[in-house]
Amino acid sequence: YSNFRKSVDSTGRRQYQVQNGPCSYTFLLPETDSCRSSSSPYMSNAVQRDAPLDYDDSVQRLQVLENILENNTQWLMKLENYIQDNMKKEMVEIQQNVVQNQTAVMIEIGTSLLNQTAAQTRKLTDVEAQVLNQTTRLELQLLQHSISTNKLEKQILDQTSEINKLQNKNSFLEQKVLDMEGKHSEQLQSMKEQKDELQVLVSKQSSVIDELEKKLVTATVNNSLLQKQQHDLMETVNSLLTMMSSPNSKSSVAIRKEEQTTFRDCAEIFKSGLTTSGIYTLTFPNSTEEIKAYCDMDVGGGGWTVIQHREDGSVDFQRTWKEYKEGFGSPLGEYWLGNEFVSQLTGQHRYVLKIQLKDWEGNEAHSLYDHFYLAGEESNYRIHLTGLTGTAGKISSISQPGSDFSTKDSDNDKCICKCSQMLSGGWWFDACGPSNLNGQYYPQKQNTNKFNGIKWYYWKGSGYSLKATTMMIRPADF
């Protein structure tokens, strides 16, 4: 008897069993399970992933696929040999010994086996193509990874080197900062000590200065007395010599030329050999009346008689006609020399006027007039100026032709207003004109847009109040 059975064993493998009499034939087919299910990225018909997988994992899986492929190939070869060697004999025996229906069964088994083999071959071809494709991709990725790795390694090396450099630099700078902090602390301590010492010194110097000022006043008075006494003595000597000498004398007495003891301006003082800037006594022309002035022996060759100075607002310049006529303030600081003296002095010789200006931003400028004089009081000390040069504007900021001098109590300007009252200070106001160096003193940051400040229009504009000004005169032929 014979029969045919198709079944699955305990391991899940498919098997074909043919019973023919006492003989039983069992065919075990190769496992298709080794080709993973579609959920796997490596399923034979699955779409390949583009993203590169972990390199070691890829190599492992590739080896597994290669092993499966080799096993399948070997099994197929064995199956072929087996069919060729054994089945021929068996088939002959079966054909001879079994009934017609058994033949049909065998044909079915054969067909099934052939179909399975063909399918298996197709699958293997697919797997082979996939493996080749995957291998090529993996090789490319491997190459790219290798290049990237090299680049990254180089960058890491560079960065490590930079980090080391920066760490070194940082350590160096930290050390420097610590050193500087130490030095700074020392310096601060030293400066505090110096400050304390200076304060003590300043206190001492202040008292010394006070003493010196007192002595200076005394010395000045003494000096004036001495000068007068010397002058009187010389006159007495001269008159005695005149009396002693007679027309019939056989010998004449040599009279020593009197040394100059009075000076009309600082130029004469400079020429006498006194070349240090400071306060000197000047004598009115054709008079014994004296006045104290500051002589600038440094600027532009020296010999300058300072007629006006502003520097700190310590002196009020909103004064009367009389005060401007006679002068006010301190020649050591802010002052006005006096219109009467300047008028007399400039009326006798040709003088130049230099005006020095300072703004609050540290800039300096000057205006130089090559001829300057003041008319007498009867003409309200009218100013006359010609020949402007300098850096404080190409146009004169003292109105041309000259204006009369005006003060708060003597309005001689050309305005329907009272310029001196409005703009503050005595000046050669026009109506009211482009300048007023005797205006209200304004400190820094309060010095702009000031109607009544210290103004020099053609240098700083109409509302700017200057920091410091000096007006000085010197003979044109100095």
Epitope: S399, D430, A431, C432, G433, P434, F451, Y457, Y458, S462
Partner: antibody, heavy 121, light 111 residues
Framework: EVQLLESGGGLVQPGGSLRLSCAAS????????MSWVRQAPGKGLEWVSL????????YYADSVKGRFTISRDNSKNTLYLQMNSLRAEDTAVYYC??????????????WGQGTLVTVSS | QSVLTQPPSASGTPGQRVTISCSGS????????VNWYQQLPGTAPKLLIY???HRPSGVPDRFSGSKSGTSASLAISGLRSEDEADYYC???????????FGGGTKLTVLG
């Protein structure tokens, strides 16, 4: 005697232009800030523009900025106002005014008689 | 709307004293001089008071000006019929970089 004489006013269409002049005499023109002030019919005074003696500083009212230009010719003692892109609201009597104090913006002590500018289509 | 504020009108009888106020801010009245102008009907304005309180020559002493903080005022004493006019206050404004006027006050002399 201080005199200020304006000229150049008249009727102009919106978007048009006019140039006003002010001839000055009787004072040192080159020492004073000069201004233009206008007065719309039945309204108050409105300052228009100011120019400093050396033309270094020029100021305009917001209402005319970018349309009007003030200038002066000290050699001719003349002040000018060039008015462009004129609007109906620019209709007014335009006065030329001299500053009270030379080299300072102190208000106006002398005024011209005015020139009428009418902007209408 | 004017930068300086004035009452639109004021009135008084002959001989009376009238005061016109002018209110501003720190950038105009508060930091600059105030001027007052008189404009008689059909004429150009005329300077009446300059620099807060000064009178130009030719202006009667019946007119006086004063200033306190950001406000100014014009006082007219012994009012006369010829004082009937428009009065304007004016000052430079630092913020606007321009001259500003009040809206004007029309003074009427009654009777």
């Amino acid at each position: 005697e201080v005199q200020l004489l304006e000229s150049g006013g008249g009727l102009v269409q919106p978007g048009g232009s006019l140039r006003l002049s002010c001839a000055a005499s009787g004072f040192t023109f080159s020492s004073y800030d000069m201004s233009w002030v206008r007065q719309a019919p039945g309204k108050g005074l409105e300052w228009v523009s100011l120019i400093s003696p050396d033309s270094s500083s020029i100021y305009y009212a917001d209402s005319v900025k970018g349309r009007f230009t003030i200038s002066r010719d000290n050699s001719k003692n003349t002040l000018y106002l060039q008015m462009n892109s004129l609007r109906a609201e620019d209709t007014a009597v335009y006065y030329c005014a001299k500053d009270l104090i030379s080299f300072w913006r102190g208000g106006f002590d002398y005024w011209g008689q005015g020139t009428l500018v009418t902007v209408s289509s | 709307q004017s930068v300086l504020t004035q009452p639109p009108s004021a009135s008084g009888t002959p001989g009376q004293r009238v005061t016109i106020s002018c209110s501003g801010s720190s950038s105009n009245i508060g930091s600059n001089y105030v001027n007052w102008y008189q404009q008689l009907p059909g004429t150009a304005p005329k300077l009446l008071i300059y620099s807060d309180s000064h009178r130009p020559s030719g202006v009667p002493d019946r007119f006086s000006g004063s200033k306190s903080g950001t406000s100014a005022s014009l006082a007219i004493s012994g009012l006369r019929s010829e004082d009937e006019a428009d009065y304007y206050c004016g000052a430079w404004d630092d913020s606007l970089s321009g001259y500003v006027f009040g809206g004007g006050t029309k003074l009427t002399v009654l009777g």
